[in-house]
């Protein structure tokens, strides 16, 4: 049905024909993400209409129906203006039960008024300053964030669940002011690893989480996006044994979605998630990634349990094959995994088995071929800075910051940027934890050490001689040019 | 309602060893994490240590190495194995939901004296 005839039906206001006439639309556009420029006038005189009832209250018979009309038309951009104002907005946060108002409600929610209302407030603080001023005024937040906090004694659908959960992203993506807040007046770090060690479930011991359901998944997903909104600007100062204890907490729960699966093709998302979180954890938590008990199959180096650094490491890998976003693809995960090898001498070691292992190939560059360490060797010179650095500074602490073991393995040319950078052009090493970490050389790099080219990293093919062939007065007359240049340069 | 009940505390010597245990009613205990909080005559109650709903523990420094926490899904109950104890861990010791504390019990004393 045309936007143009549901707005005149909506303008003779016979109930039965307006509801019939909305549930047409909304059958109709359901799939509609876009919408044509034609019919934009008439979209934007319906979804007027739909403020003013809106404003009024809606009957509570076609709530549903109605809601689901504004949701369609609150993703286009022309009706924002009508839907952004306070009222409206306060009208919906009433039916989603999120509006910070005196007096209880008295029944309990319908749940599918509720939903759509979420849905609609969803789609209005995504594409609308205006609506996000307006959520983050209407202190939204806290009610959303006491409902999370409900989880674990009420039975919420799913669906409730998610749009609550995508809310609160969404309003912690857009507003700094709301970020605060859930981080400091609401205790969001607390309430949200709370709501994710729900979401993930109960595992017995024996059984580790192995394939999170897909709505779990979901869920989880969209706490991790609020967790790492929160902790994004707070959470690299110093935090007392209390916090400390508490990101320890979360910590141990993002170690257990490094190792689990997803349903649903959705794993390296998750894990993506989970690693973006654990690079805002402060630094000296970290150390739980490498707390797990050995247990039968876990990976052993050195008496410590590997298999989550292997996990991160196998993440790592799989996104070094991705070449669209690689910022947001790697920076995450080699920065968690430099700050694990720099604060814990078995995992440097482990890590430095698997990604430099004893040179033995000395006649290809480093940055030639597809293993770890010619990938991360080639991303030292990468046009981003910051993957450069992350890459150049990973590969750098697994060499225990030692600058000719850095040059051994990457050559002078890619590691210059990095050495130029901290000053360490000459050598040396900067200040450090570093035991005296061996460094054992192959056979082969022992033979060919003395011919490797320290820029390039490998040993270079003899040039062919120039001179080669040619008569003695052609070797004169090349060395006449020769002394010309000289002396054209000496003036 | 939530209800929460410490026991097992008692007077111990400098040394001694000492379990206390902690019984859950009206929460779905298995799906919580649990921890363990103390306070001393005149000081503000800290955390001593946590347990998730995976069975992973966390404890302050203080007593890392000494304590130990445990969970039986089956009881809903939550103990706190204390060995090698001191005269600085004299307090009351209380049991809640964590990281959100839901509420608070009795708690149990323990004194550490010769």
């Known amino acids: 049905m045309e936007p143009r005839a549901v707005a005149d039906a909506l303008e003779t206001g016979e109930e039965d024909a307006v509801t019939e006439a909305l549930r047409s639309f909304n059958r109709e556009h359901s799939q509609s993400f876009t919408f044509d420029d034609a019919q934009q006038e008439d979209r934007k005189r319906l979804a007027k209409l739909l403020v003013s009832v809106l404003e009024q209250g809606l009957s509570p018979k076609h709530r549903v129906t109605w809601l689901q009309t504004i949701r369609i038309l609150s993703r286009d951009r022309s009706c924002l203006d009508s839907f952004a104002s306070r009222q409206s907005l306060h009208a919906l946060a009433c039916y989603a039960d999120i509006a910070i108002s005196e007096e209880p409600i008295p029944q309990p929610p319908d749940m599918d008024v509720l939903l759509e209302s979420l849905k609609c407030l969803c789609n209005l603080v995504l594409s609308s300053p205006t609506a996000q001023m307006l959520a983050a005024e209407a202190r939204l937040v806290v009610r959303l964030a006491e409902r999370v906090g409900l989880y674990r004694k009420r039975s919420y659908p799913h669906e409730v669940q998610f749009f609550d959960l995508r809310l609160l992203f969404l309003l912690t993506a857009l507003r700094t002011d709301v970020r605060q807040q859930l981080f400091q007046e609401l205790h969001g770090v607390r309430l949200l690893t709370d709501a994710l060690e729900l979401t993930l479930g109960v595992a017995p011991k024996e059984n580790p989480l192995v394939i999170l359901p897909a709505q779990e998944t979901e869920r989880a997903m969209e706490i991790l996006k609020v967790l790492f909104n929160i902790t994004y600007d707070s959470v690299k100062r110093e935090v007392d044994e209390e916090d400390a204890a508490l990101y320890r907490y979360l910590g141990t729960l993002l170690r257990h979605c490094v190792m689990a699966d997803a349903a649903g093709d959705r794993t390296e998302e998750f894990h993506g998630h989970t690693v973006n979180l654990l690079g805002n954890l402060p630094l000296k938590c970290l150390d739980v990634l490498l707390a797990l008990e050995l247990h039968e199959g876990s990976l052993e180096f050195m008496g410590v349990n590997m298999d989550v650094i292997n996990a991160l490491l196998a993440f790592l890998e799989k996104r070094l094959h991705q070449t669209h976003r690689l910022k947001e693809c790697v920076a995450p995960v080699l920065s968690v995994l430099t700050e694990c090898a720099r604060m814990h001498r078995p995992a440097r070691k482990f890590l430095k088995a698997q990604v430099l292992p004893p040179l033995r190939d000395v006649r290809t560059r480093p940055e030639v071929g597809d293993l770890l360490r010619n990938k991360l060797v080639r991303l030292m010179t990468h046009l981003d800075t910051d993957v450069k650095r992350v890459a150049a500074e990973f590969l750098f602490v697994l060499c225990s910051e030692s600058v000719p073991r850095f040059i051994k393995y990457t050559g002078y040319g890619n590691a210059a940027g990095l050495l130029a950078a901290r000053g360490l052009m000459a050598g040396g090493r900067p200040e450090g934890q570093y035991s005296e970490d061996e460094d054992t050389d192959t056979e082969e790099y022992r033979e060919a050490k003395a011919s490797i080219n320290p820029v390039t990293g490998r040993v270079e093919e003899k040039p062919p001689n120039p001179m080669e062939g040619m008569t003695e007065e052609q070797k004169e007359h090349e060395a006449m040019k020769l002394v010309n240049m000289f002396d054209k340069l000496s003036r | 309602q939530v209800q929460l009940v410490e026991s097992g505390g008692g007077l111990v010597q400098p040394g001694g060893s000492l379990r206390l245990s902690c019984a859950a009613s009206g929460i779905i205990f298995r799906s919580n994490g649990m921890a363990w909080y103390r306070q001393a005559p005149g000081k503000e109650r800290e955390w001593v240590g946590s347990?998730?709903?995976?069975?992973?523990?966390i404890y302050r420094d203080s007593v890392k190495g000494r304590f130990t926490i445990s969970r039986d899904n089956a009881r809903n109950a939550v103990s706190l194995q204390m060995n090698s104890l001191k005269t600085e861990d004299t307090a009351v010791y209380y049991c809640?939901?964590?990281?959100?504390?839901?509420?608070w019990g009795q708690g149990t004393q323990v004194t550490v004296s010769s």
């Open positions: 347990i998730t709903s995976f069975g992973d523990t």
């Open positions: 809640n939901t964590y990281p959100v504390n839901s509420y």
